[in-house]
Interface confidence: medium
């Protein structure tokens, strides 16, 4: 019977050796077997599992000229940059006929200086604000003890006596560096040095101080900034749009914001050139030499309505018998809000002024009746928004009243319609 077909006779003439080394080591495991006839494919096992994607090479050398002569087969498994996941028991496996043969095991072990699984990262933190840093290392050999350092000064008397994987820092008032050392029986490894940059705290209590139709005065309370004085604060304002739905935590404004810089102190800024009666969202961040704070949440604000900037136009005051007819047109100047209506004031030379609230109509008829007489009757008209009256027009005279004619009493001749608007309560 051909050699290798009997269970007690192993074809393996060379078994994997042992490798123990530090991370990153490159090593090779080898198996060698001698078989009669066609050489089999050699498989590698780690901890009993076939390695499907093993970096292995197989060399076959015939020992005779006949195909049925013996063959030497050498399989090499290359381990590049040894990692913890590479450790374990390695064997070679071949199928010969109806039998399976497995080599003696070899062992791959890892032992050396500690290896960092996690190192502290650079980050920015707000002044006097708690944060955590992480560091994780492993052997073998175990145990691995950590020692944290701040600005190169150890934070504990000896490795293993201070915080281990997570370092809780209650707050910093200046930019600092942190690193950790990992200690085991083989020696010490030092992590990267993380720079923790101390930025100003987010400003608080952003609020409106005063509102004008085209400007908003806002103020805020600065946050702590450590040993670094604030150099300036930056305010952003963006037109609100109900369709955009700026959320409190939304990271970026939906459109290019209006950006203004404020010297500090005072922590106050007047934002000008705004639209009247318009909703905005504003936010503020403050900057020191180390960089800017985080933005405050977007604060919804609104410029108030203003009064119309000009009087009604083209005022006409004509008299026809016992009636005086007055009409006008909407001001050409900006209304600075929603036009709510018009007020009309008329006055004779020796009579008190009478004020009329006309609503949104643009005409009124004064019915002249009674026993008194009035001369030099003049009429003024002003438009108004919810913010109040705009400028009054210059007095428009009616033609002179003849002596003995009536004291004017007004009434509207035309049937009015109900105002088609609602008030912003």
């Amino acid at each position: 019977a051909p050699r290798g077909t009997q269970a007690e006779e192993s074809p393996f003439v060379g078994n994997p050796g042992n490798i123990t080394g530090a991370r990153g080591l490159t090593g090779t495991l080898r198996c060698q077997l001698q078989v009669q006839g066609e050489p089999p494919e050699v498989h590698w096992l780690r901890d009993g599992q076939i390695l499907e994607l093993a970096d292995s090479t197989q060399t076959q050398v015939p020992l005779g000229e006949d195909e049925q002569d013996d063959w030497i087969v050498v399989s090499q498994l290359r381990i590049t940059s040894l990692q913890l996941s590479d450790t374990g028991q390695y064997q070679c496996l071949v199928f010969l006929g109806h039998q399976t043969f497995v080599s003696q095991p070899g062992y791959v072990g890892l032992e050396g200086l500690p290896y960092f699984l996690e190192e502290p990262e650079d980050r920015t933190v707000a002044a006097n604000t708690p944060f955590n840093l992480s560091c994780q290392a492993q052997g073998p050999p175990e145990p691995v003890d950590l020692l944290w350092l701040q600005d190169a000064v150890p934070l504990a008397t000896a490795p293993g006596h201070g915080p281990q994987r997570s370092l809780h820092v209650p707050g910093l008032n200046k930019t600092s560096s942190f690193s950790c050392e990992a200690h085991n029986a083989k020696g010490v490894t030092t992590s990267r040095t993380a720079t923790i940059t101390v930025l100003p705290q987010q400003p608080r209590n952003l609020h409106l101080v005063s509102r004008q139709p085209t400007e908003l005065e806002v103020a805020w309370t600065p946050g702590l900034s450590g040993i670094y004085p604030l150099t300036h604060c930056t305010l952003q304002a963006v037109l609100s749009d109900d369709g955009m739905g700026i959320q409190a935590g939304e990271p970026d404004p939906p459109e290019e914001p209006l950006t203004s810089q404020a010297s500090v102190p005072p922590h106050q800024l007047r934002l000008g050139s705004l639209h009247p009666h318009t909703p905005y969202h504003i936010r503020v961040a403050c900057t020191s030499s180390q960089g800017p704070s985080s933005w405050t949440h977007w604060l919804p604000v609104e410029t108030p309505e203003g009064v119309p900037l000009g009087p009604p136009e083209n005022i006409s005051a004509t008299r026809n018998g016992s009636q005086a007819f007055v009409h006008w047109q909407e001001p050409r100047a900006p209304l600075q809000g929603t036009l709510l209506g018009y007020r009309l004031a008329y006055q004779g030379q020796d009579t008190p002024e009478v004020l009329m609230d006309i609503g949104l109509r643009q005409e009124v008829t004064l019915e002249l009746q009674g026993d008194g007489s009035v001369s030099n009757l003049t009429v003024c008209v002003a438009a108004y928004t919810a913010a109040g009256d705009g400028p009054w027009s210059l007095p428009v005279p009616l033609e002179a009243w003849r002596p003995g004619q009536a004291q004017p009493v007004h009434q509207l001749v035309k049937e009015p319609s109900t105002p088609a608007f609602s008030w912003p309560w």
Epitope: L355, D357, I358, A386, G388, D389, V409, L412, P419, W423
Partner: antibody, heavy 120, light 107 residues
Framework: EVNLVESGGGVVKPGASLKLSCEAS????????MSWVRQTSDKRLEWVAS????????YYLDNVKGRFIISRENAKNTLYLQMSSLKSEDTALFYC?????????????WGQGSSVTVSS | VIVMTQSHKFMSTSVGDRVSITCKAS??????VAWYQQKPGQSPKLLIY???TRHTGVPDRFTGSGSGTDYSLTISNVQTEDLAFYYC?????????FGAGTKLELK
């Protein structure tokens, strides 16, 4: 919350003077026209006087013109009614009222009133 | 002077009823009419202005209507808390004038 509080009422003899005050809070006082309205014992409401938000325009009921003066001090959020040459027919509960934004001749908030009695 | 006339000094109603209080102006006031409610011991409260605009917080069972010289305040589904005096006022021009009031009471 809009709040109007009148003070200064009392019992006086005909011909005497009295000054009513109305302290406003809960809104931007200077943005609103204000009025005084009185209510007689027969429950009738009678407008007395009005003043524009800035104080530049004043309007009076004919039979108080020359006797009453409406004024305001926006820095103190206070409306005043100085009454002189009081008559028995001035006896009433005097209300201070805020003009609505849509028409300051419509009064959207009223105080609780200050009583004025003119009697010999 | 514009005279505001409330022809009914008293109106009787029942809870759940619909009632209309009327007011007539002596001349056209272009819908510049306000309605107030006054309960005993309280100051007047604005219900309606510009004839039909409801003041903030006023229940929608109160409805104002009218134009020219004729105006009305309608209370649908009358509640016991609606029993009070109701006054109309023209806010069109000075001198501002009120109606004499209508007392809404239970039948």
């Amino acid at each position: 919350e809009v709040n109007l509080v009148e003070s200064g009422g009392g019992v006086v003899k005909p011909g005497a003077s009295l000054k009513l005050s109305c302290e406003a809070s809960g809104f931007t006082f200077s943005n609103y026209g204000m009025s005084w309205v009185r209510q007689t014992s027969d429950k009738r409401l009678e407008w007395v006087a009005s003043i524009s938000g800035g104080g530049g325009r004043t309007y009076y009921l004919d039979n108080v013109k020359g006797r009453f003066i409406i004024s305001r001090e926006n820095a103190k959020n206070t409306l005043y009614l100085q009454m002189s040459s009081l008559k028995s027919e001035d006896t009433a509960l005097f209300y201070c009222a805020r003009g609505a934004r849509a028409s300051y001749f419509a009064m959207d908030y009223w105080g609780q009133g200050s009583s004025v009695t003119v009697s010999s | 002077v514009i005279v505001m006339t409330q022809s009914h000094k008293f109106m009787s109603t029942s809870v759940g009823d619909r009632v209309s209080i009327t007011c007539k102006a002596s001349q056209d006031v272009t819908t510049a009419v306000a309605w107030y409610q006054q309960k005993p011991g309280q100051s007047p409260k604005l219900l309606i202005y510009w004839a039909s605009t409801r003041h903030t917080g006023v229940p929608d069972r109160f409805t104002g209507s009218g134009s020219g010289t004729d105006y009305s305040l309608t209370i649908s589904n009358v509640q016991t808390e609606d029993l009070a005096f109701y006054y109309c006022q023209q806010h069109f021009t000075t001198p501002l004038t009120f109606g004499a009031g209508t007392k809404l009471e239970l039948k």
